[in-house]
Amino acid sequence: HSDGIFTDSYSRYRKQMAVKKYLAAVLGKRYKQRVKNK
């Protein structure tokens, strides 16, 4: 349930999900890069 994040605004909720998605993509790329470099 929203990872413990509470927000009353639906658009803010969507923004939080977009940020989370972006971070997941960035961290995923970094992880893949580290594995590749090893």
């Epitope: 929203s2 009353d8 605004s9 658009s11 999900m17």
Partner: antibody, heavy 117, light 112 residues
Framework: EVQLVQSGAEVKKPGSSVKVSCKAS????????MHWVRQAPGQGLEWMGL????????RYAQKFQGRVTITADESTSTAYMELSSLRSEDTAVYYC??????????WGQGTLVTVSS | DIVMTQSPDSLAVSLGERATINCKSS???????????LNWLQQKPGQPPKRLIY???TRESGVPDRFSGSGSGTDFTLTISSLQAEDVAVYYC?????????FGGGTKVEIK
């Protein structure tokens, strides 16, 4: 264009649970905000909750908190809404709907759930 | 929760005449992102609702231009400039600014 196809009508006993499915096609399922809305016979519309499948992140209406569970299966592009401890007042048409621009742009055809002893 | 109050409950209008439906919210629907998430839906008997207007005044593609939405803050209006037979339906306003998302009670539009 996104299309939503829901499961068929259900008749349930009071106290039991119902699970309604909603299969999406024509869009990136994991990146959609999938909502559930219900409509009792001859009544208005009532928002129940949503799921963002990419993180399985849910948000429920206070009224249904603890009684509704929304899940999603990305492999089949299907969302599910389970409502427990059914009572006669839960007799309604249940709709799934997809958000676009902060509004429900696409709706399923509806699933009638009848709660009767 | 935000209370959405629609008026009138029902409306009988002659073909070709104007129909006006009002919607009032208990709190401003202007979001921090600058948008107003006030929507209008049309529902015909036995069918799911259909989006007509979003962001208070943006018409859904394919919706005839006789339908228009206006208003800001807490007061909104749906206008059908020249009622056609196919416009007979129930119209709902709803807000998508604040959780929990809430709907007005609906306005039934009929032909006089």
């Amino acid at each position: 264009e996104v299309q939503l196809v829901q499961s068929g009508a259900e008749v349930k006993k009071p106290g039991s649970s119902v699970k309604v499915s909603c299969k999406a096609s024509g869009g990136t399922f994991s990146d959609l905000y999938m909502h559930w809305v219900r409509q009792a016979p001859g009544q208005g519309l009532e928002w129940m909750g949503l799921i963002y499948p990419i993180f399985a992140d849910t948000r429920y209406a206070q009224k249904f908190q603890g009684r509704v569970t929304i899940t999603a299966d990305e492999s089949t592009s299907t969302a599910y809404m389970e409502l427990s401890s059914l009572r006669s007042e839960d007799t309604a048409v249940y709709y799934c709907a997809i958000d676009q621009d902060g509004s429900f742009a696409y709706w399923g055809q509806g699933t009638l759930v009848t709660v009767s002893s | 929760d935000i209370v959405m109050t629609q008026s009138p409950d029902s409306l009988a209008v002659s073909l070709g005449e104007r129909a006006t439906i009002n919607c009032k919210s208990s709190q401003s629907l202007l979001d921090a992102d600058g948008k107003t998430y006030l929507n209008w839906l049309q529902q015909k008997p036995g069918q799911p609702p259909k989006r007509l207007i979003y962001w208070a005044s943006t018409r859904e593609s394919g919706v005839p231009d006789r339908f228009s939405g206006s208003g800001s803050g807490t007061d909104f209006t749906l206008t059908i400039s020249s009622l056609q037979a196919e416009d007979v339906a129930v119209y709902y306003c709803w807000q998508g600014t604040w959780f929990d998302l809430t709907f007005g009670g609906g306005t039934k539009v009929e032909i006089k």
